[in-house]
């Protein structure tokens, strides 16, 4: 019998209101054993996958998706979904990214060795 998969959660670091040119990292969370996390835009045809999964807690896994330099085109709703064999989960709630600008780019904190690097969403993955 297939298990019921909990809905993933989505959050953004450092928040959901981001100055133009700054970075944002979306964090998707699900149960242990998730093979693929997917970050989707409002249209399901634009998404990014990762199998680079970490422990968030003894009972949770997480994946991070970083956009290094936010533009107006990055504004809008995002949600997470995951694949835990043999099926995909439901989608998370939407998280709305707001881009503030034009403003001066804040001081760059990319020298933090723990900060994830850039990975923007691409529209090349279609269902």
């Amino acid at each position: 019998q297939e298990e019921d998969l909990p809905r993933p959660s989505i959050s953004a670091e450092p928040g959901t209101v981001i100055p133009l040119g700054s970075h944002v990292t979306f964090v998707c969370r699900g149960p242990v054993g998730v093979q693929t996390f997917r970050l989707e835009r409002e249209s399901r045809s634009t998404y990014n996958d990762t199998e680079d999964v970490s422990q968030a807690s003894p009972s949770e896994s997480e994946a991070r998706f970083r956009i290094d330099s936010v533009s107006e085109g990055n504004a809008g709703p995002y949600r997470c979904i995951y694949y835990k064999p043999p099926k995909w989960s439901e989608q998370s709630d939407y998280l709305e990214l707001l881009v503030k600008g034009p403003t001066q780019r804040p001081s760059d904190n990319s020298h933090n060795e723990h900060a994830p690097a850039s990975q923007g969403l691409k529209a090349e993955h279609l269902y």
Partner: antibody, heavy 119, light 107 residues
Framework: EVQLVESGGGLVQPGGSLRLSCAAS????????MNWVRQAPGKGLEWVAR??????????FYADSVKDRFTISRDDSKNSLYLQMNSLKTEDTAVYYC??????????WGQGTTVTVSS | DIQMTQSPSSLSASVGDRVTITCLAS??????LGWYQQKPGKAPKLLIY???SLAEGVPSRFSGSGSGTDFTLTISSLQPEDFATYYC?????????FGGGTKVEIK
């Protein structure tokens, strides 16, 4: 079909250096963390090093036994994983496996390359 | 570092036997545990991930149970191809440590 093919093993003297390579195919290399695991003759498995993806700034992690001597790296444009081994010791003699990390677990293994450190 | 203690280190069994291998973590790891099978001269193969999930292509006679610190790998009916060495591994925190292995031999 997922394939991980290691190369670069061989005989080296104590204190010497060696660079292992792993050619990956059959999957989207740049979305997976990757690892090196070794197995000394007649012994168990020992995790050596791990490298994460661009989303994590290619963060690296090492076993204490190899820290400051070994360096893991990757070239996503070449679908390749590397292990630079310096200041080699006799206890580094082992079969070295390239391992694809999936869901945090070691889902796919190469067939291994043998490193012998001896004078 | 999290220590993984596997027992027994070896066992003798016959085809058709039910075999149980245990793994004890020195601190709680939730279900961040994998089980691997290794045959002589071959690379290890993932059997179970997330403590209880069967890896792709693995026969259903293999099963995993447990969470926290105590874990079990069970082979419900041992087959000739199952004679091998089995390892547990915690993937909760680095260093990603393995158990010492359990060699399953023919009685």
């Amino acid at each position: 079909e997922v394939q991980l093919v290691e190369s670069g093993g061989g005989l080296v003297q104590p204190g010497g250096s060696l660079r292992l390579s792993c050619a990956a195919s059959g999957f989207t290399f740049n979305i997976n963390a990757m690892n090196w695991v070794r197995q000394a003759p007649g012994k168990g498995l020992e995790w050596v090093a791990r490298i994460r993806t661009k989303n994590y700034n290619y963060a690296t992690f090492y076993a204490d036994s190899v820290k400051d001597r070994f360096t893991i790296s990757r070239d996503d444009s070449k679908n390749s994983l590397y292990l630079q081994m310096n200041s080699l010791k006799t206890e580094d003699t082992a079969v070295y496996y390239c391992v694809r990390d999936r869901a945090g677990f070691f889902a796919y293994w190469g067939q291994g390359t043998t490193v012998t450190v001896s004078s | 570092d999290i220590q993984m203690t596997q027992s027994p280190s070896s066992l003798s069994a016959s085809v058709g036997d039910r075999v149980t291998i245990t793994c004890l973590a020195s601190q709680t790891i939730g279900t961040w545990l994998g089980w691997y099978q290794q045959k002589p001269g071959k690379a290890p193969k993932l059997l179970i991930y997330a403590a209880t999930s069967l890896a792709e292509g693995v026969p259903s006679r293999f099963s995993g149970s447990g969470s926290g610190t105590d874990f079990t790998l069970t082979i419900s009916s041992l087959q000739p191809e199952d004679f091998a060495t089995y390892y547990c591994q915690q993937l909760y925190s680095t260093p990603l440590t393995f158990g010492g292995g359990t060699k399953v031999e023919i009685k």
